[in-house]
């Protein structure tokens, strides 16, 4: 091998992917208030509704300090695979009675799979242990009746935005870090 | 311009040991994970090790795990690979690469015989 | 042995488009962690070609593709020119190796 000509700088610096990730977490926590607006003004909802397949919440904003880069990042992708998951299913289980939440829901989706894309770069980049995926989970059950799903939809996206917002004070504590 | 630069490669006996460098510039070298790739003489390539950017996880290929080991200094911006117990099969260019990885250096020849 | 499946050898014409496979397995391309092209020109270093399944790094000519499904990916090569002649690598993490893991290698001769 001949002396190295050196390689034009072909993609971000896992500094700026942070900053571009953060970006992209901060548009998606917006996308999934405003659908849980929508969600709210179409189907309003008494109460708090939970779905025993979501995630638990990661942990509160204040136990972060804590946190290691490599347990952040897994948990999150852990965590929003499975939202990623329950939004497929929610948009396959409830496709008309949730069709005027369309296009923003596939909106969503795409963006979710993005942010997962850009998690995975960046563990890879850092060179951080990327371990292995969670046994399949089985099957989501179609929900009992329309009302339902509306209450499947409001937990998801109650839970998502949570878990986004977790997202991004974790993602701005961690860029601190690097 | 990104720049890696690998070193130390040469010839050494069966059983003997090396230390091979890699000089970063061109990037900010503490934010990037590291690897070692080997490439036998026209054969592909095989991953070797990994090092995390703060140098707090180190992962081996099986055929070296034991003998070789991956360390970094952030503040000299280089990368180091000590190869112990060296067989005749580890004869191949080492190539450092950062990131992904996104960038390679031009590699260096290690050559294992008697 | 290499842990990723590559046919060997791919040919083409000038302007012709040729595609080169990957495939894996649960462990890795199957678990959902991105796949990576790399080129090797003649008597030079790997660079990387396709990121992240489907990304093109900057400089990188849009002629180069890439996708994935399932277990496998590909890449795809359009407008073939005599100067992509050189050996074609993919590379995934394996979740089971604790590390990337690389095809065989493609030759691919452009007639």
């Known amino acids: 091998p001949g002396p190295p000509p050196g390689s034009p700088r072909a993609s971000p610096d896992p500094r700026a992917e942070l900053d571009s990730t953060v970006l992209l977490t901060r548009s998606l926590l917006e996308d999934t208030r405003q659908l849980t607006i929508q969600l709210k003004d179409k189907f309003p909802a008494d109460g708090d509704h939970n779905l025993d397949s979501l995630p638990t919440l990661a942990m509160s904003a204040g136990a972060l300090g804590a946190l290691q880069l490599p347990s952040v990042l897994t948990r999150l992708r852990a965590d929003l695979l499975s939202y990623l998951r329950h939004v497929q299913w929610l948009r396959r289980a409830m496709g008309s009675s949730l069709k005027t939440l369309e296009p923003e829901l596939g909106t969503l989706q795409t963006r979710l799979d993005r942010l997962l894309r850009r998690l995975q770069l960046l563990m890879s980049r850092l060179a951080l242990p990327q371990l292995p995926p969670d046994p399949p989970a089985p099957p989501l059950a179609p929900p009992s009746s329309t009302w339902g799903g509306i209450r499947a939809a409001h937990a998801i996206l109650g839970g998502l935005h949570l878990t986004l917002d977790w997202a991004v004070r974790g993602l701005l504590l961690l860029k601190t870090r690097l | 311009e990104v720049q890696l630069l690998e070193s130390g490669g040469g010839l050494v006996q069966p059983g003997g040991s090396l230390r091979l460098s890699c000089a970063a510039s061109?990037?900010?070298?503490?934010?990037?994970?590291m690897h070692w790739v080997r490439q036998a003489p026209g054969k592909g390539l095989e991953w070797v090790a990994v090092i995390s950017y703060d140098g707090s996880y180190k992962y081996y290929a099986d055929s070296v795990k034991g003998r070789f080991t991956i360390s970094r200094d952030n503040s000299k911006n280089t990368l180091y690979l000590q190869m112990n117990s060296l067989r005749a099969e580890d004869t191949a260019v080492y190539y450092c690469?950062?990131?992904?990885?996104?960038?390679w250096g031009q590699g260096t020849l290690v050559t294992v015989s008697s | 042995q290499s842990v990723l499946t590559q046919p060997p050898s791919a040919s083409g014409t000038p302007g012709q488009r040729v595609t080169i496979s990957c495939s894996g397995s649960?462990?890795?391309?199957?678990?959902?962690?991105?796949v990576h092209w790399y080129q090797q020109l003649p008597g030079t270093a790997p660079k990387l070609l396709i990121y992240?399944?489907?990304e093109r790094p900057s400089g990188v000519p849009d002629r180069f593709s890439g996708s994935k499904s399932g277990t496998s990916a590909s890449l795809a090569i359009s407008g073939l020119r005599s100067e992509d002649e050189a050996d074609y690598y993919c590379?995934?993490?394996?979740?089971?190796?604790?590390?990337?893991?690389f095809g065989g290698g493609t030759k691919l001769t452009v007639l």
């Open positions: 690469a950062a990131g992904v990885p996104d960038y």
């Open positions: 061109g990037f900010t070298f503490s934010s990037y994970g």
């Open positions: 992240s399944n489907n």
């Open positions: 649960s462990s890795n391309i199957g678990s959902d962690y991105d």
């Open positions: 590379a995934a993490w394996d979740f089971s190796l604790y590390g990337p893991v």
